[in-house]
């Protein structure tokens, strides 16, 4: 388990509903977000990265390997 800071959605929502996929990037305020190990069913969710489970949202997110981006780390960064 761990935690980090992240920014809310641009509409001010804290993305707290179970199942929501939060992708906002516009800073508003720093929010402490806690993570846990991803459920086994998401083992293959992150293609080029590591899966983590956002506790408040109860949804997986990915930490991408260098050179990859996208919700599932599925896109190659051609400028990397």
């Amino acid at each position: 388990d761990g935690n980090t800071t992240r920014t809310p959605e641009t509409n001010g929502s804290l993305c707290g509903a179970p199942g929501e996929n939060c992708t906002g990037t516009t800073p508003r305020q720093k929010v402490k977000t806690h993570f846990s190990r991803c459920p086994k069913q998401y083992k293959h969710y992150c293609i080029h990265g590591r899966c983590r489970f956002v506790v408040d949202e109860q949804t997986p997110s990915c930490i991408c390997e260098k050179g990859y981006f996208g919700a599932r780390c599925e896109r190659v960064d051609l400028f990397y």
């Epitope: 179970p18 996929n21 459920p39």
Partner: antibody, heavy 116, light 106 residues
Framework: QVQLLESGGGLVQPGGSLRLSCAAS????????ISWVRQAPGKGLEWVSY????????NYADSVKGRFTISRDNSKNTLYLQMNSLRAEDTAVYYC?????????WGQGTLVTVSS | DIQMTQSPSSLSASVGDRVTITCRAS??????LGWYQQKPGKAPKLLIY???SLQSGVPSRFSGSGSGTDFTLTISSLQPEDFATYYC????????FGQGTKVEIK
Amino acid sequence: QVQLLESGGGLVQPGGSLRLSCAASGFTFSRYWISWVRQAPGKGLEWVSYIDSTGTFINYADSVKGRFTISRDNSKNTLYLQMNSLRAEDTAVYYCARGGSLFDYWGQGTLVTVSS
Amino acid sequence: DIQMTQSPSSLSASVGDRVTITCRASQGIISYLGWYQQKPGKAPKLLIYAASSLQSGVPSRFSGSGSGTDFTLTISSLQPEDFATYYCQQYDALNTFGQGTKVEIK
């Protein structure tokens, strides 16, 4: 307010096909995972399938794998379930529900009856 | 597959009673467990997620506890609107529900 409205249910013969739809409103559909969950008459709940927000990550229950296909159209705020090779044991109320792991909002359900 | 076993399958209780429903997973699921309430002819309603977190808008008389394989839903003081069927659901491996516990009026 969040609304999920299923349609497309009905009576179909064994071996037949049916396509269910779920129209979503009241939330940003493209940001959420969505699932199908079913309930046979007088029985418990059974998760059927989910699809992630982008439509690229999908899972199915073993009981429907290879016969059912989940999909979504984020431009239309609509979820689909294509059901092929239907069996009597697929008879159930089919709910669409918001979320992939947990289901915080549900539709009212649509009844699928598979019978000859 | 992970099997979820609820007990009891049904129970009779009176308004004001403390009610406890248990759910056992066939293998460890950490805290990846939810609880739902369903009334006849209606869709289920999420009560508890992550084993012990109360879903927004759910009365505080509902609480959840447990981790690993053994989990509990407690209603501290049963209200008339609480007579319903309750389901647990694990979401570590692919989602599976318990068979349900029907709470009836004594």
